[in-house]
């Protein structure tokens, strides 16, 4: 167990041109607050996925009113740290989202209005017990400077907060087989309380006799690395020798979610869906009221005047979730045209267009014929973002620059002889056949199977094909 601590140093305009407008004005004074969301491992940073390691809201900062004509300075910040307690081992690698929120204090009907000013996200490695790590992140024209650290809560120590320490019973040394607890040299490692043989690197325990595994390890003593290879058991890999997960109790067995939360299995662990008024990895954190501002994205908080009564967030259009923290999937309406890829950026929809298309919704077919001449009288034809030339008779190739051999395809049927001609080709038909391509047989009685040859042409005469 331990606490992740975040210290915001400054939030203001970043370097470079295009300084952002101040978020507050004389007519609309406002104040800032921050939200941090932590997820274990180097997971995707989707804002909507649960904050499995925990989340925290800062206090509100001092009220700020813009000075007319002055550039936006660093804005006044809330006092104190943001603290996210974690109950289990510290994972070592984590993803974070830090959101800067503005609370407008004008004459709002129904109380203050909240809006998201900036969101930064990242993935980091961090050992518990280490020094403060400093970071700078940019979101558009804004810049956020902050420090963070993870520290263990006594009696836990170590880079993952999995070792336990106790004060020394004797002033001079620790008991037999027990080492001093670095960096707390005046304390000793507690007697081994985990299951005998439980891996000291990959396992930990919170109760005597148990052995719980860190992410990526399995087996009764947490000595078997989890394989990502396919295994046949319904819970995934099944053989301890191959490093496969052992079938048996699932992560939701016994429902680890407190306070009426419902449990669902995830590929690596479990996820609790908490009832209103509770949050945290196992729905163990309660006591949130509307005064804590639990509704995000401009949601309106109702009820929850005291910690014993649940609050309800009424979400604005386009947002959902018990805290209005999830965005509705607007891309499912497929607004992008011509095979464009839809991206919901929150403040707007964007389309990533296929080659040959452009525009906010990929609605413009780029004119591939612009500036492209087809030689020798050919005409340019557009289609699908590519251009092609429809060539005049006797020419071919991409730009109609190649002289085509009209006889190359052997167009004369029934043994007719082909002659190239300036306006096309001419077929000299074998006896018994006629037509531009010698396609019609001449019947023995002299009548053709199809209309007679044009006046002035006898069967067997060369037929010019125009």
């Amino acid at each position: 167990a331990g606490v992740f601590e975040l210290q915001i140093h400054s939030f203001g305009p970043g370097p470079g041109p295009g300084a952002p407008r101040s978020p507050c004005s004389a007519r609309l004074p406002c104040r800032l607050f921050f939200r941090v969301c932590l997820k274990p491992g180097l997971s995707e940073e989707a804002a909507e996925s649960p904050c499995a390691l925990g989340a925290a809201l800062s206090a509100r900062g001092p009220v700020y009113t813009e000075q007319p004509g002055a550039p936006a300075p660093d804005l006044p910040l809330p006092d104190g740290l943001l603290q996210v307690p974690f109950r289990d081992a510290w994972p070592g690698t984590f993803s974070f989202i830090i959101e800067t929120w503005r609370e407008e204090l004008g004459d709002q009907i129904g109380g203050p209005a909240w809006s998201l000013l900036a969101r930064v996200a990242g993935r980091r490695r961090l050992a518990a017990g280490g020094p403060w790590a400093r970071d700078i992140q940019r979101a558009g024209a804004w810049e956020l400077r902050f420090s963070y650290r993870a520290r263990c809560e006594p009696p836990a120590v170590g880079t993952a907060c999995t070792r336990l320490c106790r004060p020394r019973s004797a002033p001079s040394r620790c008991g037999p087989g027990l080492r001093p607890c670095a960096p707390l040299e005046d304390e000793c490692e507690a007697p081994l309380v985990c299951r005998a043989g439980c891996s000291p690197e990959h396992g930990f325990c919170e109760q005597p006799g148990e052995c719980r595994c860190l992410e990526g390890w399995t087996g009764p003593l947490c000595t078997v690395p989890v394989s990502t290879s396919s295994c046949l058991s319904p819970r995934g890999p099944s053989s301890a020798t191959t490093g496969c997960l052992v079938p048996g109790p699932g992560p939701c067995d016994g429902n680890p979610c407190a306070n009426g939360g419902s449990c669902s299995e995830t590929p690596r662990s479990f996820e609790c869906t908490c009832p209103r008024g509770f949050y945290g990895l196992r729905c163990e954190v309660s006591g949130v009221t509307c005064a804590d501002g639990p509704c995000f994205n401009g949601g309106l908080c109702v009820g929850g005047a005291d910690p014993d009564s649940a609050y309800i967030c009424h979400c604005p259009p386009g947002f959902q979730g018990s805290n209005c923290e999830k965005r509705v999937d607007r891309c499912s309406l497929q607004p992008c045209r011509n095979g464009g890829l839809c991206l919901d950026l929150g403040h707007a929809l964007r389309c990533r267009c296929r080659a040959g298309f452009a525009g906010p919704r990929c609605e413009h077919d780029l004119d591939d014929c612009a500036g492209r001449a087809c030689a020798n009288g050919g005409t340019c034809v557009e289609g699908g973002g590519a251009h092609r030339c429809s060539c005049a008779l006797g020419f071919g190739g991409r730009d109609c620059r190649e002289r085509a051999d009209p006889c190359a395809a052997r167009p004369c049927a029934h043994g007719g002889r082909c002659y190239a001609h300036f306006s096309g080709l001419v077929c000299a038909c074998a006896p018994g056949y006629m037509g531009a391509r010698c396609e019609f047989p001449v019947h023995p009685d002299g009548a053709s199977a199809l209309p007679a040859a044009p006046p002035g042409l006898r069967p067997g005469d060369p037929q010019r094909y125009l």
Epitope: L333, Q334, P360, C362
Partner: nanobody, 120 residues
Framework: EVQLVQSGGGLVQAGGSLRLSCAAS????????MGWYRQPPGKQREMVAG???????IYADSVKGRFTISRDNAKNTVYLQMNSLKPEDTAVYYC??????????????WGQGTQVTVKP
């Protein structure tokens, strides 16, 4: 300013029918995509049926063969005809539209929501 005004909805017995309509008005140059979403109690909002940017018609698997979306381009209106309704169709139904404004920008808008309740 663009408004999506919804009408229809209400209470119906399982197996019955309802028709929803949604009219878009305001500074609209063109409607790029328009359709219907729904949000059952305690669940996520999901797309039900729509006209895509390419003009195709799309439906959620759960409503195929029962719901039909149609439109009147002259009135900037879409309709959702819901037949063979089931209790699991109970939800708040939202109209949604991706609109090109006179400014040539595109914006996504939502209607106010309409309750549809299907009794077993």
């Amino acid at each position: 300013e663009v408004q999506l005004v919804q009408s229809g909805g209400g209470l119906v017995q399982a197996g019955g029918s309802l028709r929803l309509s949604c009219a878009a008005s305001g500074s609209i140059l063109s409607i790029n995509a328009m359709g219907w979403y729904r949000q059952p109690p305690g669940k996520q909002r999901e797309m039900v049926a729509g006209f895509t940017g390419d003009g195709n018609t799309i439906y959620a698997d759960s409503v195929k063969g029962r719901f039909t979306i149609s439109r009147d381009n002259a009135k900037n209106t879409v309709y959702l005809q819901m037949n063979s309704l089931k209790p699991e169709d109970t939800a708040v139904y939202y109209c949604a539209a991706d609109v090109q404004l006179f400014s040539r920008d595109y914006e996504f808008y939502w209607g106010q929501g309409t309750q549809v309740t299907v009794k077993p």
